[in-house]
């Protein structure tokens, strides 16, 4: 759970209770067991800017 009163994470990131901050969902490729990765599965990635 994200701490009460904190701003939601931006697209492409998810709240980490372990690290007490928003973390990049992209890092779940290398570290899929990170606590925040469960929150990434439901959230769409940040859009590519080509």
């Amino acid at each position: 759970e994200q701490a009460p009163g904190t701003a939601p994470c931006s697209r492409g990131s998810s709240w980490s209770a372990d690290l007490d901050k928003c973390m990049d969902c992209a890092s779940c490729r290398a570290r899929p067991h990170s606590d925040f990765c469960a929150g990434c599965a439901a959230a769409p990635p940040a859009p590519f800017r080509l």
């Epitope: 492409g12 372990d18 690290l19 007490d20 973390m23 990049d24 969902c25 992209a26 890092s27 490729r29 290398a30 570290r31 990170s34 990635p45 940040a46 590519f48 800017r49």
Partner: antibody, heavy 119, light 111 residues
């Protein structure tokens, strides 16, 4: 404020040894992969070693150029990472940086320490 | 190993103009969702400073003048408008695999 404070370095003869240290503060050290990156005019920025987490028994990875000669280690109780360098060669000369990454990018770097391998 | 080729090696730009730096990977470093390319700025006597992650996402505190784009094998760092403080060497780095490698750097100078 995140800080990576390095120590060690200096002049060493070919075949000699040197140990570098890096003490971290301002972030949850035990969750981060710790790395050493060196820089020289010849090789540019060159990643040389990484140590991961206790939960995986501290796996390590090395660049081919240093494999078998360099050893990376960490002490989470001291928020510290080390690089033991043996059988040093002139081509190991450069600026050595410790750097942390959660998984992908090196978001914080030490100030750098210079190693010169010369007779 | 994935090789990153940066171009140009050096670049001279007038104040207020656009600087464009290219980074080409020897293989794709993108999934369908993310690109595993990151950008750094280094000034003389200092360590590299992290600027942009996953091809296009600025680190906190990095001015909007810096932007990154690209996917697959071709990536670009744009700086516009260029300011005096931007004189530095810029490096790309991939995190697709071990070893993570860096480009050779692009030196940006002001005219």
């Amino acid at each position: 404020e995140v800080k990576l404070q390095q120590s060690g370095g200096g002049l060493v003869q070919p075949g000699g040894s040197m140990k570098l240290s890096c003490v971290a503060s301002g972030f949850t050290f035990s969750y981060y992969w710790m790395n050493w990156v060196r820089q020289s005019p010849e090789q540019g920025l060159e990643w040389i070693a990484e140590i991961r987490l206790q939960s995986n028994d501290y796996p390590t990875h090395y660049a081919e150029s240093v494999k078998g000669r360099f050893t990376i280690s960490r002490d989470d109780s001291k928020n510290s990472v080390y690089l033991q360098m043996n059988n040093l060669r002139p081509e190991d000369t450069g600026i050595y940086y410790c750097a942390c990454r959660y998984a992908d990018y090196f978001d914080h770097w030490g100030q750098g320490t210079t190693l010169t391998v010369s007779s | 190993d994935t090789v990153l080729t940066q171009s140009p090696a050096s670049l001279v730009v007038s104040l207020g103009q656009r600087a464009t730096i290219s980074c080409r990977a020897s293989q794709s470093v993108s999934t369908s969702d993310y690109s595993y390319i990151h950008w750094y700025q280094q000034k003389p006597g200092q360590p590299p400073k992290f600027l942009i992650k996953y091809a296009s996402n600025r680190d906190s505190g990095v001015p909007a003048r810096f932007s990154g784009s690209g996917s697959g094998t071709d990536f670009t760092l744009n700086i516009h408008p260029v300011e005096e403080d931007d004189t530095a060497i810029y490096y790309c780095q991939h995190s697709w695999e071990i070893p993570p490698t860096f480009g050779a750097g692009t030196k940006l100078e002001l005219q």
